[in-house]
């Protein structure tokens, strides 16, 4: 069955049952997630707006899925396995009387069970397991997962020792096949493509389906996370990496000494504080720097900006912009522009978009 392909998972409580104080609901749900994070590398974070991985909903009767609730008793709740959209979401029947104790239906105990489903667990045949299909109150102060529950969840995600590789949520590996995935910077490096995101980069070797994820610091310990733009001059075996108003030069995959340097050495005006994206075109021997809704063109031979810039992205790259996240050059005729979770193959000879893709389409998602 499906699992979350990341260790940092968000949840949001869509609405609150009137049966309990909001603080008690928050606490019960938080503690229920904690039960599973205690025995896995998973980290859960509550968000209050936007799209969470797991949406917690209190609803009665028909509520937008195929599985209408049945009034008091019977089905107490249900949850969907990991995935986008409704995937992971946990629904609690508002016709139950939700409580913090043994009266009514205990929200914490029910939530532990449902979150198990949200993480990809099925039902257990062990009556002592929290994933056993029927509800039975146990003292929540002494509650523990059964050996069967732990075995089940660790077969999906491993044990918490794996957290030592990812010490905090910011370090969490983004889900490569998340349809909403965006990238900070993308560049070719020889026959490889580097995709940068937060502290990570994915390495795609041309024409091979396999990709690997790495920490930037594992390859280049002196470089920061959050690379914002990157480009390659393959003939010189050089890669330029940008963050804020600084850039680093990598030669033959090794960081050059005496870097970082200021981006203003390229000739940007003082108001430019960071580069969104950059790409070198070897046919023209020019680098295009994208900043907000504009771009500059830099002559790599003469080491100076071309006159007449900046220009509007939308004016000269039909269908692209107003801003972009990343871009790289490939196959002698295409730029691949990244905007959020979308990617545009742009033929710079025809000067038009020839294909629209998801940003992660390179990974066989």
């Amino acid at each position: 069955g499906p699992v979350w392909r990341k260790h940092y998972i968000t949840y949001r409580i869509n609405n609150y049952t009137p049966d309990m104080n909001r603080e008690d609901v928050d606490y019960a749900i938080r503690k229920a997630f904690q039960v599973w994070s205690n025995v896995t590398p998973l980290k859960f974070s509550k968000i209050n707006t936007g799209m969470a991985d797991i949406l917690v909903v209190f609803a009665r009767g028909a509520h937008g899925d195929f599985h209408a609730f049945d009034g008091k008793g019977g089905i107490l709740a249900h949850a969907f396995g990991p995935g986008s959209g409704i995937g992971g979401d946990a629904h609690f029947d508002e016709d139950e009387f939700w409580t913090t104790h043994s009266g009514g239906t205990n929200l914490f105990l029910t939530a532990v069970h449902e979150i198990g489903h949200s993480l990809g667990l099925g039902h257990s045949s062990d009556p002592k397991a929290v994933m056993f299909p029927t509800y039975k109150y146990v003292d929540i102060n002494t509650f523990r997962l059964s050996a069967d529950d732990i075995r089940g969840i660790q077969s999906l995600y491993g044990d918490p020792k794996e957290n030592q590789r990812l010490p905090n949520p910011d370090n969490s590996e983004p889900a490569l096949c998340d349809p909403n995935l965006s990238f900070d910077a993308v560049t070719t490096v020889g026959n490889k493509i580097f995709f940068f995101k937060d502290r990570f980069f994915w390495l795609k070797v041309s024409e091979r389906p396999k990709t690997s994820v790495n920490l930037i610091s594992s390859l280049w310990p002196t470089l920061p996370s959050g690379i914002e733009a990157a480009y390659e001059i393959e003939a010189r075996n050089q890669v330029f990496l940008f963050k804020d108003d600084k850039y680093w030069l990598i030669s033959n995959l090794r960081p050059e000494p005496n870097y970082p340097k200021s981006i203003h050495s390229f000739g940007f005006p003082n108001f430019v504080k960071k580069i969104d994206a950059a790409v070198f075109n070897p046919r023209f021997y020019r680098t295009y720097f994208f900043v907000d809704n504009q771009y500059w063109r830099y002559d790599e031979r003469r080491q100076m900006m071309d006159p007449g810039y900046p220009k509007l992205i939308t004016k000269n790259f039909q269908g692209i912009g107003p801003k972009i996240d990343a871009v790289f050059y490939s196959k002698n005729k295409y730029y691949y522009f990244f905007q959020g979770s979308n990617q545009f193959e742009y033929d710079f000879l025809l000067q038009r978009i020839t294909k629209t893709l998801k940003s992660n389409s390179w990974f066989g998602c």
Epitope: G64, H78, S84
Partner: antibody, heavy 122, light 103 residues
Framework: EVQLLESGGGLVQPGGSLRLSCAAS????????THWVRQAPGKGLEWVSG????????MYADSVKGRFTISRDNSKNTLYLQMNSLRAEDTAVYYC???????????????WGRGTLVTVSS | DIQMTQSPSSLSASVGDRVTITCRAS??????LNWYQQKPGKAPKLLIY???SLQSGVPSRFSGSGSGTDFTLTISSLQPEDFATYYC?????FGQGTKLEIK
């Protein structure tokens, strides 16, 4: 490549029976919920029935409950719809559609077959 | 049962136009709404799921928004291939469809 291919449609008299099949390929069939959705000529889409990956859970629209039976044979990667006591209003193109993996159906139909036409007429 | 009301039922527009189709649920369905495109004689195609997520391979001129009871599908700049019928859907309920025709 995910593919769904329906067959078994045809002309049948009111009160008659028909069995539709949907052959699936390109994915692990037994993991996925699968559904039948129909479309009467010139009309909109109407969900008919759905079945979980294991076959243990089935659902029906009120308009077909008691007359239609959904089933699947995971060893043959095939979905079925047994239609009995057919009526003129059951005339439609019947599509099979793939849903998500998991214990519950999302009703998220990401892949569809081309459809097979069922005509109920005397 | 939840009802889905889609409007308008038909719409004439020109290439390059921005078009919006709306769908209203009779009660909250959170973000559990999908949009499909169907061309004559073809099977429906999933465009948007979970109200606002673009299905892989669908052009970015399509976008969805909304939550609770009110949802919209927007095509930012109509292309010739976009003339079709569009359906909203949640679980077993489809909207009645919006036929988008060339003006």
């Amino acid at each position: 490549e995910v593919q769904l291919l329906e067959s078994g449609g045809g002309l049948v008299q009111p009160g008659g029976s028909l069995r539709l099949s949907c052959a699936a390929s390109g994915f692990t069939f037994s993991d996925y919920w699968t559904h039948w959705v129909r479309q009467a000529p010139g009309k909109g889409l109407e969900w008919v029935s759905g079945i979980s990956g294991s076959g243990g859970m089935t659902m029906y629209a009120d308009s077909v409950k008691g007359r239609f039976t959904i089933s699947r044979d995971n060893s043959k990667n095939t979905l079925y719809l047994q239609m009995n006591s057919l009526r003129a209003e059951d005339t439609a193109v019947y599509y099979c559609a793939r849903d998500i993996v998991g214990p519950y159906s999302a009703g998220l139909f990401d892949y569809w077959g081309r459809g097979t036409l069922v005509t109920v007429s005397s | 049962d939840i009802q889905m009301t889609q409007s308008p039922s038909s719409l004439s527009a020109s290439v390059g136009d921005r078009v919006t189709i709306t769908c209203r649920a009779s009660q909250s369905i959170y973000t559990y709404l999908n949009w499909y495109q169907q061309k004559p004689g073809k099977a429906p195609k999933l465009l948007i799921y979970a109200a606002s997520s673009l299905q892989s391979g669908v052009p970015s001129r399509f976008s969805g928004s909304g939550s609770g009871t009110d949802f919209t599908l927007t095509i930012s700049s109509l292309q010739p291939e976009d003339f079709a019928t569009y359906y909203c859907q949640q679980a077993g309920i489809f909207g009645q469809g919006t036929k988008l025709e060339i003006k």
